[in-house]
């Protein structure tokens, strides 16, 4: 799939209609949308491609990454390659600050969750962040979904402020990350 | 780029103890387990256990049980594996491997042959 | 322990030549499968992770594909450098394990 990457027109995209009719609880029936349709609008400043920057357009810049946060609904298996063909992973939170970034973000749509890059085989395997990195729930607490009809929650998601486990199979948005190096 | 650099090559008797070193450098040590994988001569892979460099958890191989020991020490960067009880069939080439994307062993050691003979 | 067996055991071929390994799990493992190729008195080396995700640096000559049980590891043309033996690593419960491998020789 191409990337095309879209300028920010500067006006409040919070007001283009979005998030209309696309609901945590109500994933039934998702549209297919370009990649180019299906980023986030955000309050957070984007870049515009008008400077340099290092991030593309219409990323959000915080510290040392840029964000995508993507509208098109997919698995968690299918978030992560979309990350990759636009050259970037599912969110890792690396800090406590990053953190508080991401749930600032997410938490102005309260109807949506975001796919991050956290996952693990089934319940008896430690969560792993994509890169194969170990999880630390120094960090943040993973509230768990399960239940005796769907016992193997093995993906996470963050919800406004919370960051709960679910089925992987089960469709959502999701957070791009693409780090540079300044 | 990331490295890891194992201990030398060692001889020992039935019933003694190994313990092989494994030094990271290229990337953040307490961030990725540990991997330990031996392979005897002539033969196949064998995964032995993991140990978190970051909160020293591990996690054994029912095989070794009892007589595996994982160890780390984070301000040099090194991982250990020791080895009690030795058998002649515990002959092997001992690797450790940093963990990667979907637990899978992306970093590899060169390699410590252990040889138990009497 | 989940059993991992590969087919063929060996097999010889030809530069250019397309190779397929399969790589069956005794049980399903989702797409937590690895794939490894191996050289006399070298360690390892990762080629694909998550079953058909490849490793950076890794030639786009090489490509898993399956889930659950049954995966393959495909060659698309055989290079002079590729003559090894591959292993494919399940990592879906403890202990992880490997299959006992593929021998790919000259033929």
């Known amino acids: 799939t191409m990337a095309i990457w879209r300028s920010n027109s500067g006006s409040n995209t919070l007001e283009n209609g979005y998030f209309l009719s696309r609901n945590k609880e109500n994933h039934s029936q998702p549209t297919q949308s370009s990649l180019e349709d299906s980023v986030t609008p955000t309050k957070a400043v984007k870049t515009t491609g008008v400077l340099s920057s290092p991030c593309p357009p219409n990323w959000i810049i915080y510290e040392k990454s840029c964000y995508l946060f993507s509208m098109s609904l997919n698995s968690w298996d299918g978030s992560k390659r979309q990350c990759w063909q636009l050259g970037s992973n599912l969110l890792k939170i690396d800090s406590s600050n990053e953190l508080g970034f991401i749930v600032k973000q997410v938490s102005s749509q309260p109807d949506n969750s975001f796919w991050i890059g956290l996952s693990r085989p089934q319940t008896e395997v430690p969560w792993l962040w994509e890169d194969g990195s170990t999880f630390s729930s120094n960090l943040f607490q993973i509230r768990t979904t399960a239940t005796q009809e769907n016992p193997s929650p093995n993906c996470v998601w963050i919800h406004v402020s919370v960051i709960y486990d679910q089925l992987c199979s089960v469709p959502s948005y999701s957070i791009c990350e693409k780090k540079f190096s300044m | 780029q990331v490295q890891l650099v194992q201990s030398g090559a060692e001889v020992k008797k039935p019933g003694a103890s190994v313990k092989v070193s494994c030094k990271s450098s290229?990337?953040?040590?307490?961030?990725?387990?540990i991997h330990w994988v031996r392979q005897a001569p002539g033969q196949g892979l064998e995964w032995m256990g993991w140990?978190?460099?970051?909160?020293?958890?591990?996690n054994y191989a029912q095989k070794f049980q009892g007589r595996i020991t994982m160890t780390r020490d984070t301000s040099i960067s090194t991982a250990y594996l020791e080895l009690s009880r030795l058998r002649s069939d515990d002959t092997a080439v001992f690797y450790c491997a940093r963990n990667s994307g979907s637990y899978s062993f992306g970093y590899w050691g060169q390699g410590t042959l252990v040889t138990v003979s009497s | 322990d989940i059993q991992m067996t590969q087919s063929p055991s060996s097999v010889s071929a030809s530069v250019g030549d397309r190779v397929t390994i399969t790589c069956r799990a005794s049980q399903g493992i989702s797409s937590w499968l690895a794939w490894y190729q191996q050289k006399p008195g070298k360690a390892p080396k990762l080629l694909i992770f998550?079953?058909?995700s490849l490793q950076s640096g890794v030639p786009s000559r090489f490509s898993g594909s399956g889930s659950g049980t049954d995966f393959t590891l495909t060659v698309s043309s055989l290079q002079p450098e590729d003559f090894a033996t591959y292993y494919c690593q399940q990592a879906y419960s403890f202990p992880f394990t490997f299959g006992p491998g593929t021998k790919v020789d000259i033929e």
């Open positions: 140990i978190n460099p970051n909160s020293g958890d591990t």
């Open positions: 998550g079953a058909s």
């Open positions: 290229g990337y953040t040590f307490t961030a990725y387990y």
